[in-house]
């Protein structure tokens, strides 16, 4: 296993609709054809997997149908979007990139993006 540098923004504020997008950029030392991207959430020293996708270079990222993540790739950059976020989901979202094929296997883990989320104000009751 060889180390690889992964860069991501330090802080992002999600939209009022609970959507946060950020770029995860990795310094690919070679010509990888198969890449796996995993988003991990760290909150109070507990780490959980948010979503993961494996893609072939030049193709779209494919997350599971029920995933809260979507993404696109361009060269050594992955543009990740996480949807359905609520205030309780505020935390550090870490991008993990693995170059799966061809060998050698490379692993890179970013420092994390602190995503802040605020629940939208409830709409005032309207009289009909």
């Amino acid at each position: 296993c060889k180390a690889m540098h992964v860069a991501q923004p330090a802080v992002v504020l999600a939209s009022s609709r609970g959507i946060a997008s950020f770029v995860c950029e990795y310094a690919s030392p070679g010509k990888a054809t198969e890449v796996r991207v995993t988003v991990l959430r760290q909150a109070d020293s507990q780490v959980t997997e948010v979503c993961a996708a494996t893609y072939m270079m030049g193709n779209e990222l494919t997350f599971l149908d029920d995933s809260i993540c979507t993404g696109t790739s361009s060269g050594n950059q992955v543009n990740l979007t996480i949807q359905g976020l609520r205030a309780m989901d505020t935390g550090l979202y870490i991008c993990k990139v693995e170059l799966m094929y061809p060998p050698p296997y490379y692993l890179g883990i970013g420092n994390g993006t602190q995503i802040y989320v605020i629940d939208p104000e409830p709409c005032p009751d309207s009289d009909f």
């Epitope: 923004p9 330090a10 802080v11 909150a43 505020t90």
Partner: antibody, heavy 117, light 107 residues
């Protein structure tokens, strides 16, 4: 090294608006947020809200909602805070601060805004 | 919004004495609590992050502890240059909030 340099002191009349700037250097501007914190004479720190320089999204404290606008110009790594309908109790030192995962790690030197008729 | 309360409001201390400032949150904030020092006519400065993590360049006499709702800033062996206001701040949930501050002066 990281630096946040703010615009100079302002004297305004009640009802007017003020726009304070905060120029960042020494880091990738879009990787962090900028918060605006004010301090009235002899008082504590009050967070007015912040802007994510990465995407321009804003979160304003309820007290200032509708009266404050925070923006960024990523081409010049500058953040702005505009406060409208100024009142005498808006007289304060206004600070910009870099929003990191761990609180506000760098602060500007402060801008005094005096509101007086 | 999360409300932070600090005690005491004011403390007058002799040099070399130990100072303890407490900060209580209205709900659990994990370890997302940070401490700032503000000397007269200066900008605030980050002192401790995540309740207990030290900041490069900050003297080792400053330390923090706590998690959940109760936090403490300790200054071991106070020096004259430590005369300042100290604020706690939470980044657990929006909006960000500060405690009202504790003013420390030298006897």
């Amino acid at each position: 090294q990281v630096q946040l340099v703010q615009s100079g002191a302002e004297v305004k009349k009640p009802g007017a608006s003020v726009k304070v700037s905060c120029k960042a250097s020494g880091y990738t501007f879009t990787n962090y947020g900028i918060s605006w914190v004010r301090q009235a004479p002899g008082q504590g720190l009050e967070c007015m809200g912040w802007i994510s320089a990465y995407n321009g999204n804003t979160n304003y404290a309820q007290k200032f909602q509708g009266r404050v606008t925070m923006t960024t110009d990523t081409s010049t790594s500058t953040a702005y805070m505009e406060l409208r309908s100024l009142r005498s109790d808006d007289t304060a030192v206004y600070y910009c601060a870099r929003v990191a995962a761990a609180g506000f790690d760098y602060w500007g030197q402060g801008t005094l805004v005096a509101v007086s008729s | 919004e999360i409300v932070l309360t600090q005690s005491p409001d004011f403390q007058s201390v002799t040099p070399k004495e130990k100072v303890t400032i407490t900060c209580r949150a209205s709900q659990s904030i994990g370890s997302s609590l940070h401490w700032y020092q503000q000397k007269p006519d200066q900008s605030p400065k980050l002192l401790i992050k995540y309740a207990s993590q030290s900041i490069s360049g900050v003297p080792s006499r400053f330390s923090g502890s706590g998690s959940g709702t109760d936090f403490t800033l300790t200054i071991n062996s106070l020096e004259a240059e430590d005369a300042a206001a100290y604020y706690c701040h939470q980044s657990s949930s929006l909006p960000f909030t500060f405690g009202p501050g504790t003013k420390v002066d030298i006897k």
